[in-house]
């Protein structure tokens, strides 16, 4: 008799989901050096903890303590490089930028990246078929409560001046309802973070307006400011030249406005 | 699946250069790297050199300032510019395609790479 399985709205779990997990872990602690200690299996273990036989809409971070223990990872907290809507090219930066960090540069945020996951409750099986969407399931789920915990803890973790990429091309330059505005933005600890400084990139190769003056980032100014924190913005008018400076600065155009 | 094919290898006299290519069916993309591996007899399997899609190179430190890893993306090619080789050089060269999304590592059959003194 075919057991009757919850039906949700968002996508299930990535295929190959525990062998990606895994491999990612391994592949991780390899190119870093300084995580070699971390025993990927146990890694697994804690991670699959946090969500196999729970209902996916009754996630807590409290599931998730297990592994973020087992993922602690020292990065330099004046290093730290935010994203909201612009993940690649935040992405890109680092991998040229070596010394700066977006969450996903960190091994818990390397593993987890663009993959989705869910279990069942009262079963020790992966849900496959089906995973709760944020908005018309629940917010609780997997991997909503994932990313809200490494993302406050990664905000905690902030000193000196933070910088964020945002996306100038969205209607919403600085949205409150994405990670950013809603979880990162209300943990940067103001008697450690200095400034935060916005990079909103431009999509358009015309587009010349100051993008610092949108609504939405005089929002995000008044929010930062009444947390003790300094707030700049600079426009990133071509981000293609921008990543060429960042590799090549010695370059004789590169010392004009990007 | 990720094809790989590496050629180049060969027998050397030490002080001598060697140039590995391996071709990927994929290119390198976002998080997904190339790079060679090598394998001496009775000894495991060691990084050399790896490069990421912008040209983020790394190096084992036995080969650093004598061996260099380029990429032709246009090709989908890695290559290894092997220089002042040393009999301790001397295993079989393995081309590796690390595939972020996959969570998967393919590899190329190997190619010999021999050192004589």
């Known amino acids: 008799v075919p057991r009757w399985r919850q039906q949700w709205s968002g996508p299930g779990t990535t295929k190959r989901f525990p062998e990606t997990v895994l491999a990612r872990c391994v592949k991780y602690t390899e190119i870093h050096p300084e995580m070699r200690h971390v025993d990927c299996q146990s890694v697994w273990d804690a991670f699959k903890g946090a969500f196999i036989s729970k209902h996916p809409c009754n996630i807590t971070e409290e599931d998730y303590q297990p592994l973020m223990k087992l993922g602690t990872q020292t990065v330099p907290c004046n290093k730290i490089l935010l994203w909201s809507r612009i993940k690649d090219l935040a992405h890109q930066f680092t991998q040229v930028q070596r010394d700066m960090f977006t969450l996903e540069d960190t091994l818990l945020g390397y593993l987890a990246d663009d993959l989705t996951w869910c279990g069942e409750f009262n079963t020790s099986k992966i849900n496959y078929q089906s995973c709760p969407d944020w908005r018309k399931d629940c917010s609780n789920n997997p991997v909503s409560v994932f990313w809200k915990t490494v993302s406050r803890r990664f905000a905690e973790a902030a000193c000196d001046v933070v910088h964020v990429m945002l996306n100038g091309s969205r209607s919403k330059i600085f949205d409150k309802n994405s990670t950013f505005g809603s979880v990162e933005v209300h943990n940067l600890q103001p008697e450690k973070v200095q400034t935060l400084e916005a990079w909103v990139i431009h999509g358009g190769r015309e587009d010349s307006r100051d993008l610092c003056q949108d609504p939405t980032i005089k929002e995000l100014e008044s929010i930062i400011s009444k947390r003790n924190i300094q707030f700049s913005c600079k426009n990133i008018y071509r981000p293609d030249k921008f990543l060429q400076c960042v590799k090549n600065p010695e370059d004789s155009s590169c010392t004009s406005e990007i | 699946e990720v094809q790989l094919v590496e050629s180049g290898g060969g027998l050397v006299q030490a002080g001598g250069s060697l140039r590995l290519s391996c071709v990927a069916s994929?290119?390198?993309?976002?998080?997904?790297?190339m790079g060679w591996y090598r394998q001496a007899p009775g000894k495991q399997r060691e990084l050399v050199a790896r490069i990421a899609s912008l040209g983020i190179t790394n190096y084992a430190d036995s080969v650093k300032g004598r061996f260099t890893i380029s990429s032709d993306n246009a090709k989908n090619t890695v290559y290894l510019q092997m220089n002042n080789l040393k009999p301790e050089d001397t295993a079989v060269y393995y081309c590796?395609?690390?595939?972020?999304?996959?969570?998967?590592?393919?590899w190329g059959q190997g190619t010999q790479v021999t050192v004589s003194s």
């Open positions: 590796n395609y690390w595939h972020y999304a996959a969570g998967r590592d393919y």
């Open positions: 994929e290119r390198i993309f976002s998080r997904n790297t």
